[in-house]
Amino acid sequence: MAVTACQGLGFVVSLIGIAGIIAATCMDQWSTQDLYNNPVTAVFNYQGLWRSCVRESSGFTECRGYFTLLGLPAMLQAVRALMIVGIVLGAIGLLVSIFALKCIRIGSMEDSAKANMTLTSGIMFIVSGLCAIAGVSVFANMLVTNFWMSTANMYTGMGGMVQTVQTRYTFGAALFVGWVAGGLTLIGGVMMCIACRGLAPEETNYKAVSYHASGHSVAYKPGGFKASTGFGSNTKNKKIYDGGARTEDEVQSYPSKHDYV
């Protein structure tokens, strides 16, 4: 039960995280005009990964896409790449984890297969979260560097009284969304990996022995029925009516002196 809960929670947390990564990637407010200690302007500038926007006091907002690929800073391209890789890995991870969920029955899928899929999706979520965190952190570092550079050159003299105030940019909402979303995806991935350990069938050091009741060809397996969720085919605990003595692995067992009661 705890395994199912951990797996389910991991899936939900990762789903929220990936939705957040997608939202952050699409958001325009990766960097916003710094309003602190600056002259109050009637224009507010903010920039995203794909376009830059200007909101005027009049209420008019104008956005312009970055229609060049080669003209963009390498760091911005790297951040775009990291975010896209994060989204793609996360999306694949979600797809895989849906089939890995213990509460979803797909044919006669073995628990071991579900465990492997859970581990795969967990790793994908971890990498996806790390990509998002890395992307956002690279962008944040770029902002900090530019912020202090523009602060050093805050007022560029243009001769006499005339001055040009450089627009400084600070952290936008998308950065915080990205960090939180990346963290959630990472946590979700770790939960999936933890759930995988509980899903993996425990190896036993003995062969299950069949006891044949006289008059009935019913195989009895020691250890009783394991607790199950009620979903999925419980192949390891099914009764065998074919009259043959079978092991846990469905391999023919030869009678020994202890076989019959």
Epitope: V40, S57, S58
Partner: antibody
Framework: EVMLVESGGGLVKPGGSLKLSCAAS????????MSWVRQTPEKRLEWVAT????????YYADSVKGRFTISRDSAKNTLYLQMISLRSEDTALYYC?????????????WGQGTSVTVSS | DILMTQSPSSLSVSAGEKVTMSCKSS????????????LAWYQQKPGQPPKLLIY???TRESGVPDTFTGSGSGTDFTLTISSVQAEDLAVYYC?????????FGAGTKLEL
């Protein structure tokens, strides 16, 4: 047709109060940024205050900060300017203006103005 | 506050003449985000409120004759009337639309 009609001006003693109104019509009042601009007897134009459309943020000229309050009633399509502690230098023709949404913050419509005289 | 300096303060012209007036701001009105200048020009005739002529330093407001041209960038701006008509006699004001407080120039009076 866009119309801005100011009212509420008059003669007031120094230290007195006055509330100007501006009735707007012909456009979606709540979504536009509105301003008050005054013209002194020397014909100089002075921006007084601005209220941002939608957000409601307000900005004031340093000379009126703490004394004047700009507000709006979107239900009545009316802009207000509450003026207290009036001084003789506040004597002017007060215009109600609208900031055009595609005009780079420029004031595309102006009312006819209402006169405020502060004198003892 | 941004200081807007207009010159000349008055200008005597004849009909059909080309007129140029200047406006200088103490700080750049060019926004780096969209590379637009936030400067407007207004025309005020006696007994009337100001009327918007040019916004964004160079864009004519609808209904304004093409004899009016705005130009300039950053801190130096110019309003040109290619052929002055009698109805153009008025006071022309430039305005900073970029920084609060919005500030106006003292005006350039166009007279015969």
């Amino acid at each position: 047709e866009v119309m801005l009609v100011e009212s509420g001006g008059g003669l007031v003693k120094p230290g007195g109060s006055l509330k100007l109104s501006c009735a707007a019509s012909g456009f979606t009042f709540s979504s536009y940024t509105m301003s008050w601009v005054r013209q002194t007897p020397e014909k100089r134009l002075e921006w007084v205050a601005t209220i941002i459309g939608g957000y409601g943020n307000t900005y004031y000229a340093d000379s009126v900060k703490g004394r004047f309050t700009i507000s709006r009633d979107s239900a009545k399509n009316t802009l207000y300017l509450q003026m207290i502690s009036l001084r003789s230098e506040d004597t002017a023709l007060y215009y109600c203006t609208r900031l055009g949404q595609t005009q780079r913050n420029a004031m595309d419509y102006w009312g006819q103005g209402t006169s405020v005289t502060v004198s003892s | 506050d941004i200081l807007m300096t207009q010159s000349p303060s008055s200008l005597s012209v004849s009909a059909g003449e080309k007129v140029t007036m200047s406006c200088k701001s103490s700080q750049s009105l060019l926004n780096s985000g969209n590379q637009k200048n936030y400067l407007a020009w207004y025309q005020q005739k006696p007994g009337q409120p100001p009327k918007l002529l040019i916004y964004g330093a160079s864009t004519r407001e609808s209904g304004v004759p093409d004899t009016f041209t705005g130009s300039g960038s950053g801190t130096d701006f110019t309003l040109t009337i290619s052929s002055v008509q009698a109805e153009d006699l008025a006071v022309y004001y430039c305005q900073n639309d970029y920084y609060y407080p919005f500030t106006f120039g003292a005006g350039t009076k166009l007279e015969l």
